[in-house]
């Protein structure tokens, strides 16, 4: 009956962790004698190819300084301990502790048997490192030039993480990769870039990080922060201001980052009706008179700059009873 070596084609281990490379001689054959079990790295330099051996009488030896006896052990193989005990070498599973990048590669498990000869199996050990992810908004001020408004960083992954962005904005990503502080790892940084405007402020974009060590992609929401001057509009005009009306109000509506620091109401004519009283963002009109036939201007300032809006007012002689007119400016 032929014997064969059962190994896994590929084994993945975490950097710094412990991994087992399974190796079994199958099936159990009566009278089959295993004279030596060896683990080798066929692709390593000649003096580092022989990694571990298990002798039926003398037990394990670890002939290569890399990985070395401190980091290697046979999981179940047992040597003969005297007259009555047979060596148990059918399971030659090898454990590697404190995995390093240099441990990655092909490993051959070989059984020297009598009378069947040598049989072997090969396993590819992949060393992976789970990256640590973070994403953050960059505080930016509006401009005409594309600017990085968010960063997504996947630190010390092996292989490098894949970063993408989910957003409805008009953007592009710029990626850089640098070696991590842990040898063999890579830190990936993706810069979410757009022309910063008020439209982007407060918008949440999502950084998506994919890595084979993750069961599912990591999704990290980032709320953008764009400093921009006030964007102003005026509401409250209903196209039905008539002489003597007393319940009229104009509101200066603002979107800005940071918050407005001041509101200023004026008219384009330069004359300001005395019955109009500015109260911050509101202009309260006590009684409409003919001086209101003008254009009101609301000017808003914040730390970045200023914005303004105009509202043309038409004063009627009598109320318009035909129906409510359009509001806003």
């Amino acid at each position: 009956q032929d014997v064969r070596v059962q190994v896994l084609p590929e084994v993945r281990g975490q950097l710094g962790g412990t991994v087992e490379l399974p190796c079994h001689l199958l099936p159990p054959v009566p009278g089959l004698y295993i004279s030596l079990v060896t683990w080798q790295r066929p692709d390593a330099p000649a003096n580092h190819q022989n990694v571990a051996a298990f002798h039926p009488k003398m037990g394990p030896s670890f002939p290569s300084p890399k990985p070395g006896s401190e980091r290697l052990s046979f999981v179940s193989a047992k040597q003969s301990t005297g007259q009555d005990t047979e060596a148990e070498l059918q399971d030659a599973t090898l454990a590697l502790h404190g995995l390093t990048v240099e441990d990655e590669g092909n490993y051959t498990c070989e059984f020297a048997t009598f009378p069947k000869g040598s049989v072997r199996g090969m396993t590819w050990l992949r060393v992976i490192a789970k990256p640590k992810n973070q994403a953050e908004a960059q505080k930016v001020t509006f401009s005409q030039d594309p600017t990085t408004v968010a960063l997504c960083i996947s630190k010390e992954g092996r292989p490098p993480a894949r970063i993408s962005w989910l957003s409805s904005l008009d953007w592009e990503a710029k990626e850089t990769q640098v070696s991590g502080t842990l040898a063999g790892t890579v830190t990936v940084t993706s810069r979410f870039t757009l022309v910063p405007s008020g439209r982007a402020d407060g918008v949440t974009v999502t950084c998506k990080v994919e890595h084979e060590s993750f069961e599912e992609p990591a999704l990290i929401p980032v709320t953008l922060s764009v400093r921009y001057p006030p964007e102003v509009s005026i509401s409250g005009y209903d196209d039905n201001w008539y002489l003597g009306r007393t319940d009229a109000t104009l509101s200066c509506d603002v979107r800005s980052n940071p918050e407005p620091t001041g509101y200023d109401w004026s008219t384009t004519s330069g004359t300001f009706p005395t019955s109009a009283v500015a109260q911050g963002s509101q202009l309260v009109i006590h009684a409409v008179d003919s001086l209101f036939n003008t254009t009101f201007v609301c000017t808003v300032t914040n730390a970045v700059g200023m914005g303004r809006a105009e509202q043309v007012i038409f004063v009627r002689e009598t109320p318009n009873t035909a129906g409510a007119g359009a509001t806003g400016g």
């Epitope: 022989n50 051996a53 009488k57 030896s61 070395g68 006896s69 009598f114």
Partner: antibody, heavy 115, light 111 residues
Framework: QEQLKESGGRLVTPGTPLTLTCTAS????????MSWVRQAPGKGLEWIGV??????STYYASWAKGRFTISKTSTTVDLKITSPTTEDTATYFC??????????WGPGTLVTVSS | SFVLTQPASVQVNLGQMVSLTCTAD??????ASWYQQKPGQAPVLLIY???SRPSGVPDRFSGSTSGNTATLTISGAQAGDEADYYC?????????????FGGGTQLTVTG
């Protein structure tokens, strides 16, 4: 540079115990099975015994049992000749076992047993 | 006990191929190794695990086994190959263990 060097060989009178020491450099002795081999003048190689990498097992040639003791520390392997006879006159080599072969040898140390 | 038999001496002409044999008195369950030893020097491992060659050993040295016999072949012998050659194997039979050397073959390169 991986090296082995034997020491302690000298002229002794029959029956006087003698300990030879093999010192390793450039590698860790605890990772390897280590053997002692001797060669009488003009004769062939003769295996004396082995100590396992862990130090937990020692095996001797049938003719050497009781006449020799092998022990090890983290950097040395010792061979004690308990009661030398004139037939023990030889060059004594320590050797490192790797995958079924002795791939590193010391230059040898000469032991002469004479009255 | 386990015995390995080698011819005491073999001659070969310079540049010729030569095969050195090593016969076990009982069928070995283990690998054969071959060593070269020059006068006044320590042995050097040439072949281990029947056919494997350590790094640094010229590829004109090769090993093979068939039944009870292990063979070291030197293809294109050189003057520097003149030396004693020892075969060896480990005897794992029973509860004990020993490593056994053959008696050695003295190789002379002529011409």
């Amino acid at each position: 540079q991986e090296q082995l060097k034997e020491s302690g060989g000298r002229l002794v009178t029959p029956g006087t115990p003698l300990t030879l020491t093999c010192t390793a450099s450039g590698f860790t002795i605890s990772s390897y099975h280590m053997s002692w081999v001797r060669q009488a003048p003009g004769k062939g190689l003769e295996w004396i015994g082995v100590i396992s990498a862990s130090g937990g097992s020692t095996y001797y040639a049938s003719w050497a049992k009781g006449r020799f003791t092998i022990s090890k520390t983290s950097t040395t392997v010792d061979l004690k000749i308990t009661s030398p006879t004139t037939e023990d006159t030889a060059t004594y080599f320590c050797a490192r076992e790797s995958y079924g072969g002795y791939n590193l040898w010391g230059p040898g140390t000469l032991v002469t047993v004479s009255s | 006990s386990f015995v390995l038999t080698q011819p005491a001496s073999v001659q070969v002409n310079l540049g010729q191929m030569v095969s050195l044999t090593c016969t076990a008195d009982t069928l070995s369950r283990s690998y054969a190794s071959w060593y070269q030893q020059k006068p006044g020097q320590a042995p050097v491992l040439l072949i281990y695990r029947d056919t494997s060659r350590p790094s640094g050993v010229p590829d004109r040295f090769s090993g093979s086994t068939s039944g009870n016999t292990a063979t070291l072949t030197i293809s294109g012998a050189q003057a520097g190959d003149e030396a004693d050659y020892y075969c060896a194997t480990d005897d794992n039979s029973g509860s004990s263990y020993q490593y056994v050397f053959g008696g050695g073959t003295q190789l002379t390169v002529t011409g």
